[in-house]
C-alpha cells in the first residue's frame, strides 16, 4: 500500500531550495517560532559542550526488514503548506500562583523563553526537513535496537502527564545511533493534532503529518537525564511520522485502547510490556539527523535528532482516538500539543541516504546541495 | 547525592494528620518544575502503589483510597511536594516515598508513616 509516486520518482520535497524559512513563506504561522523579540543577544546553550565519552559498540543487531506495504516519505506528493489555522504552539501561561511560570503550556502567553532562557536557543527542535538540502552522509548506518520486544510483564505506566500521553519504559532498551553512540530508552510519548487538523512536530517541506512518535533516549555516558541536559548528545529521539493508512495497526491498538482510562490529567494506568520496536517505522536505515533541543521546556540543546524517514500508518479510527480522548490543564482538551517549526539558524540535517538526489530520468547530473560533515571532522 | 528527600512521617493515632514534605536537591532541582510529581506508598508485604500524582501545570490525581483525605501541592519556587494527610486509617501505614517523573523516575529514600492506637 504506496501512494502513487510524484516528481518522477524523486524523493518528497523535490522542488525547494529556499534556506531557512520552510518554502519562504514567512507569514505561515504554525511553520516558524513566534516573534524573536526575546532572543537573547548570544546562544541559550546549558553549560557543557563537551564530547561524550565510551566508544563500545552494542552487541550486534540485525537491522529490521522492512514491512511490505509500508509507506516511506519519499512516496508521497510534495505538499505546499497551507497554512495551518492554528497559532503556533510556543507559548506557556503565568501559573496560578502568579510568579512561578514554569507551569506552560501550548498556546497562551507568556512565551516559552520566561518559562527556560534555552527555548530562545539558537538551535532548537522541532525543524522543517527539505530532503533536497539533507546533506548525504553515508557513515550513518542503519539504527541499532537491542531489548524493545518487552514481555507482559513487568507492566509499564501509561500517564496522561497534561502535555502528552507518555509511556515509561523499563531499563533494558539499548539503541545505538553508531559505534560509541550507545543510548538506553527511557520513555515514549506522543504529539497529536486535532480533528481535520494535523499534529507532528517536524514538517517535510512544510507538510505536517497526523501524529508523531518519540522515543527519548539517554546517553550511557550519563546516568541521569539531569546530567545530560544541555551536553551534546546527552539525549538522543527517535521520532516517526503516523499516518492515515486502512488497517488498524495492532501495536498501537495495545496503547489506544488504553486511552479512556487515563482521560484525566495526571492520571495513570498500568499496560502491559509490548514490542516497542513495533511502533516505529521497519526500515532503520532511511532517516534524517539533526541536532536540536527538547520540543517542549527547558528546551535544552544538545538533543540528537533522528527522523524516520518511512512513516507509520494508523488507522483512521486510531488517529481520532488519540487526539479526541484525553484532557489537558484547566478542563481543556489535549489536542494540537506541538511547538512551532524553528529556524536551523545554519544547521544542516544529514541524510542517511540520498535523499536530495532526483532520481528521475531528467536528471543527468544528480546534485546534492549540502555535504556531510563525517563524524569526528 | 541525593536527590529527593522526604520528611514529615511518623507516628500517628487514626483520625489524626500528617504532612509529608519532599524536597528536591541537586540536579533534581533543575528539572523539578518540568516534572510530574507523585507520592507512592508501600506497605510490608504489598506493592508499592501510587497515592497522589500532580503535573507540572497542576492537575492532581489520587487513589481511590485517599481521595477526599489527601492533597497534594507543590511549590516549585521551593522545590517542594507536599502531602497533606487527614483523617489518617490504619490501613494507610506504609513508607511513603515521593517521585519525579521527568522522561525518567527520580525516587526518595522514604518516610515511614505508622498510624497505630
Known amino acids: 500500500q504506496r501512494l502513487p509516486r510524484m516528481q518522477e520518482d524523486s524523493p518528497l520535497g523535490g522542488g525547494s531550495s529556499g534556506e531557512d524559512d520552510p518554502l519562504g513563506e514567512e507569514d505561515l504561522p504554525s511553520e516558524e517560532d513566534s516573534p524573536r523579540e526575546e532572543d537573547p543577544p548570544g546562544e541559550e546553550d546549558l553549560p557543557g559542550e563537551e564530547d561524550l565519552p565510551g566508544e563500545e559498540d552494542l552487541p550486534e543487531v540485525k537491522p529490521k526488514s522492512e514491512e511490505e506495504g509500508s509507506l516511506k516519505l519519499e512516496d508521497l506528493p510534495t505538499v505546499e503548506a497551507p497554512g495551518d489555522p492554528q497559532e503556533p504552539q510556543n507559548n506557556a501561561h503565568r501559573d496560578k500562583e502568579g510568579d512561578d511560570q514554569s507551569h506552560w503550556r501550548y498556546g497562551g502567553d507568556p512565551p516559552w523563553p520566561r518559562v527556560s532562557p534555552a527555548c530562545a536557543g539558537r538551535f532548537q527542535s522541532p525543524v522543517d526537513i527539505r530532503p533536497q538540502l539533507a546533506a548525504f552522509c553515508p557513515a550513518l548506518r542503519p539504527l541499532e535496537l537491542l531489548g524493545f520486544q518487552l514481555p507482559p510483564l513487568p507492566e509499564l505506566r501509561l500517564r496522561n502527564n497534561g502535555h502528552s500521553v507518555q509511556l515509561t519504559l523499563p531499563p533494558g532498551l539499548e539503541m545505538a545511533l553508531g559505534p560509541g553512540r550507545e543510548y538506553r530508552a527511557l520513555q515514549l510519548h506522543l504529539h497529536w493534532g486535532a480533528a481535520g487538523r494535523p499534529g507532528s512536530e517536524h514538517t517535510v517541506e512544510g507538510h505536517r503529518f497526523p501524529a508523531e512518535i518519540h522515543v527519548v533516549h539517554l546517553s550511557t555516558a550519563f546516568a541521569r537525564v539531569d546530567e545530560a541536559l544541555g551536553r551534546p548528545g546527552g539525549l538522543a529521539v527517535l521520532a516517526a511520522f503516523l499516518e492515515e493508512g486502512p488497517e488498524e495497526n495492532s501495536a498501537y491498538e495495545q496503547l489506544l485502547s488504553r486511552l479512556e482510562e487515563i482521560a484525566e490529567e495526571g492520571s495513570e494506568t498500568q499496560v502491559p510490556g509490548l514490542d516497542i520496536s513495533a511502533l516505529l517505522p521497519s526500515d532503520f536505515s532511511r532517516y534524517f539527523q539533526y541536532e536540536g533541543s527538547l520540543t517542549t521546556p527547558p528546551c535544552a540543546q544538545g538533543v540528537i535528532w533522528t527522523v524516520f524517514n518511512q512513516t507509520v500508518m494508523l488507522s483512521a479510527k486510531q488517529l481520532h482516538t488519540l487526539s479526541d480522548t484525553l484532557w489537558g490543564p484547566g478542563d481543556s482538551r489535549l489536542q494540537l500539543n506541538f511547538r512551532a517549526t524553528q529556524p536551523l539558524n545554519g544547521r544542516v540535517i544529514e541524510a542517511s541516504f540520498p535523499a536530495g538526489v532526483d532520481s528521475s530520468p531528467r536528471a543527468a547530473e544528480p546534485v546534492q546541495l549540502n555535504s556531510c560533515l563525517a563524524a569526528g571532522d | 547525592q541525593v536527590q529527593l528527600q522526604e520528611s514529615g512521617g511518623g507516628l500517628v493515632q487514626p483520625g489524626g494528620s500528617l504532612r509529608l514534605s519532599c524536597a528536591a536537591s541537586?540536579?533534581?532541582?533543575?528539572?523539578?518544575?518540568?516534572?510530574?510529581m507523585a507520592w507512592y506508598r508501600q506497605a510490608p508485604g504489598k506493592q508499592r502503589e501510587l497515592v497522589a500524582v500532580?503535573?507540572?501545570?497542576?492537575?492532581?490525581q489520587y487513589s481511590s483510597s485517599v481521595k477526599g483525605r489527601f492533597t497534594i501541592s507543590r511549590d516549585n519556587a521551593k522545590k517542594t511536594v507536599l502531602l497533606q494527610m487527614n483523617s489518617l486509617k490504619p490501613e494507610d501505614t506504609a513508607v511513603y516515598y515521593c517521585?519525579?517523573?521527568?522522561?525518567?523516575?527520580?525516587w526518595g529514600q522514604g518516610t515511614q508513616v505508622t498510624v497505630s492506637s
Open positions: 541537586g540536579g533534581a532541582r533543575n528539572i523539578f518544575s518540568f516534572a510530574a
Open positions: 500532580i503535573t507540572s501545570a497542576g492537575g492532581t
Open positions: 517521585n519525579a517523573d521527568y522522561y525518567q523516575d527520580y
